[in-house]
Interface confidence: medium
């Protein structure tokens, strides 16, 4: 008799794929544009990335460091009107893209939370949550919560408002902290809160260190849903050398939780390569004309247009991973088991019941390595086969779809492999 199927877990929309942050509308659209009407025209691009949610803004009125001139219910006219926002929501909904609004109050100022007037600001946030929920947003983000006194209790109250409106609404909190204990204390009092932090930001050194960080985090947070990013707002290139971008894309898309990216992460957008551009929000490179300041500074392979035409580009990899992440049960909500694969490597299995299973092997080092996969680390329910099919490699040149013998697995420097194999009873 066939074994009984495991009951599927309840899945919220943010469990089904990546979130895409557009913190600076002007930088994202470029060419002196940067409003809600223009963003609406970019939704097809977001659809092509298969992202599930757009984290937008902040876009509310905020005069730097002035509480009285900060109105969370009003859209800054530079970004457009409420009706432009409404129109964006409607278009996004038709494309199955959820919209999360960033309500970090003093986003133009020194202290995001006006440290001397916390209670006033907290009341404004409560009113804003009610208002924007009625207006149709799918969730909220608040950043820099390390600057918010009594953050845990405020977050719990805001979470109650958000979830009280609908279980389908999401609250994201962001912190610059990379300290696991601080992160856990924020999570403890807030069930269902999605927290973005700098926890993984110094993970780029070795596979062992990354494995240790990921497994510590997953063990400490138990079975709660988590998110994966390298910071609450910044680009991957702020933390990683170019050669590790593909590896991290593969890892973020295949760990159990919601991957969160900033605009430009999909093309390896790097402020350092664009003289004069701010580190936190460089102009998005749609094509070679997007950065006219220095002629010749931008080559086609740095742009959306150029990378869209190249199946071996970072953008093409992002799209493929995003597609897999949103449709494979084992990647959507499968169990996670990390195991030893040798020095410099991080490897893990994702599996769900009798569905196709996935093996991820990541080489963080700058030398080629043979993987010694220690299957003995794995529980019986997640045993390794002798061979697995190569779904994709972060490096060009591998023959995709071909079966690889796991005992003889060799990885190039900075290479990541995503392999698939069937469930075997």
């Amino acid at each position: 008799r066939a074994p009984r199927c495991r009951e599927l877990p309840a899945q919220k929309w943010w469990h089904t794929g990546a979130l895409y942050r557009i913190g600076d509308l002007q930088a994202f659209q470029g060419h002196g544009a940067g409003n809600l009407a223009g963003l609406k025209g970019r939704l097809d691009y977001l659809s092509s990335l298969k992202v599930k949610g757009l984290v937008l803004g902040p876009i509310h009125k905020n005069q730097k460091d002035d509480v009285a001139q900060t109105d969370l219910l009003q859209i800054d006219p530079n970004f457009g009107s409420k009706e432009d926002f409404d129109s964006l929501l409607q278009s996004a909904k038709k494309k199955s893209i959820r919209v999360i609004l960033d309500l970090t109050p003093n986003y133009r100022g020194e202290n995001s939370w006006f440290s001397t007037q916390v209670d006033t600001v907290a009341t404004k946030v409560k009113d804003a949550l009610e208002f924007w929920l009625q207006a149709g947003v799918d969730g909220f983000q608040v950043r820099d919560i390390e600057n918010l006194k009594d953050a845990s209790s405020f977050l719990a109250e805001w979470q109650n408002i958000t979830k009280g409106f609908s279980e389908d609404r999401l609250l994201i909190a962001g912190t610059n902290s990379s300290d696991l204990q601080q992160i856990l204390s924020l999570l403890e009092s807030n069930k269902d809160l999605l927290l973005t932090s700098s926890y993984l930001s110094d993970s780029g050194s070795t596979g062992e260190h990354t494995k240790s960080l990921v497994t510590q985090y997953l063990n400490a947070t138990g079975n709660r849903w988590c998110s994966w990013s390298l910071s609450q707002a910044r680009l991957l290139t702020s933390f990683l050398p170019a050669q590790l971008l593909r590896l991290y894309q593969l890892m973020l898309f295949t760990l159990p939780g919601t991957p969160v990216f900033s605009y430009g992460d999909e093309i390896g957008l790097d402020a350092a390569a664009l003289p004069g551009q701010p580190m936190e929000a460089p102009v998005m490179l749609w094509d070679e004309s997007s950065f006219p300041d220095i002629p010749g500074a931008v080559s086609a392979n740095m742009t959306v247009k150029g990378q869209s035409e190249d199946p071996g580009s970072l953008l093409s990899l992002f799209r493929r991973l995003s597609d897999q992440r949103s449709k494979e049960r084992s990647l959507l909500h499968g169990d996670f088991h990390a195991f030893s694969a040798g020095p410099g490597l991080f490897s893990y299995i994702r599996h769900w019941d009798q569905n196709e299973r996935f093996l991820v092997v990541l080489n963080f080092g700058d030398v080629g390595l043979s993987a010694g996969l220690q299957a003995s680390d794995l529980p019986a329910s997640a045993s390794l086969p002798a061979k697995a099919d190569l779904l994709l490699s972060t490096q060009p040149g591998r023959e995709e779809g071909s079966p690889l013998e796991l005992e003889r697995l060799k990885l190039e420097p900075h290479e990541g492999l995503l392999l698939r194999f069937p469930y075997a009873a």
Epitope: Q74, I75, P77, E83, D86, S87, Q90, Q134, A135, G136
Partner: antibody
């Protein structure tokens, strides 16, 4: 409370032009588009187009592209629609309308209508 | 353009009756369907937006339902003040289009 006050009834000759107004009050004028809708006697409603008072951007029904010109004056919180080359087909009640901020393209607030009669 | 069809152009009912008015779109409009009431003096009011959401101030005897291309408005306990013409409107795609209207009368 939100109000849209339209100008009074107009009698015009064929071939002439006329300009009607819609004065908004009770909300921030630049936050919402002003839409215009036509209703001929005993007939259904037809959407003409809208203007974004903030940017003066307009979008209109192809059918009215050469007939209606939409403008707005931020200083007086007033939107205008000019109809040109009038014929008897333009005899109708014209409404201005505004959406609610709620998520859905519906017209929550309507003016009382301006009756236009085109007759020689 | 999307065509909106209200097959019943007029309808007679008694006070207290439950009345249903239907509306069909020429294609799937993803629930972006609104209902308006136009009184004999020309005043237009929004009743229902996004298929089933009641606009503020509208009595709960009005309700909406439907999906895809087929939608309906129901008045559960007809009152004298409900005598009016009812229009459906799609907000899915520009240009926005309205149905031909259903005139409700007391028999």
């Amino acid at each position: 409370q939100v109000q849209l006050q339209q100008s009074g009834a107009e009698l015009a000759k064929p071939g002439a032009s006329l300009k009607m107004s819609c004065k908004a009050s009770g909300y921030t004028f630049t936050d919402y588009y002003i839409h215009w809708v036509k209703q001929r006697p005993g007939q259904d409603l037809e959407w003409i187009g809208y203007i974004n008072p903030n940017s003066a951007y307009t979008d209109s029904n192809q059918k009215f592209k050469d007939k209606a010109t939409l403008t707005a004056d931020k200083s007086s919180n007033t939107a205008y629609m000019q109809l040109s080359s009038l014929t008897s087909e333009d005899s109708a009640v014209y409404y201005c309308a505004r959406k609610g901020h709620f998520y859905a393209p519906s017209f929550a607030y309507w003016g009382q209508g301006t009756l236009v009669t085109v007759s020689a | 353009d999307i065509q909106m069809t209200q097959t019943t152009s007029s309808l007679s009912a008694s006070l207290g009756d439950r009345v249903t008015i239907s509306c069909r779109a020429s294609q799937d409009i993803s629930n972006y369907l609104n209902w308006y009431q136009q009184k004999p003096d020309g005043t237009v009011k929004l009743l229902i937006y996004y298929t089933s959401r009641l606009h503020s101030g509208v009595p709960s005897r009005f309700s909406g339902s439907g999906s895809g291309a087929d939608y309906s408005l129901t008045i559960s306990n007809l009152q004298q003040e409900d005598i009016a013409t009812y229009f459906c409107q799609q907000g899915d795609t520009l240009p926005y289009t309205f149905g031909g209207g259903t005139k409700l009368e007391i028999e």
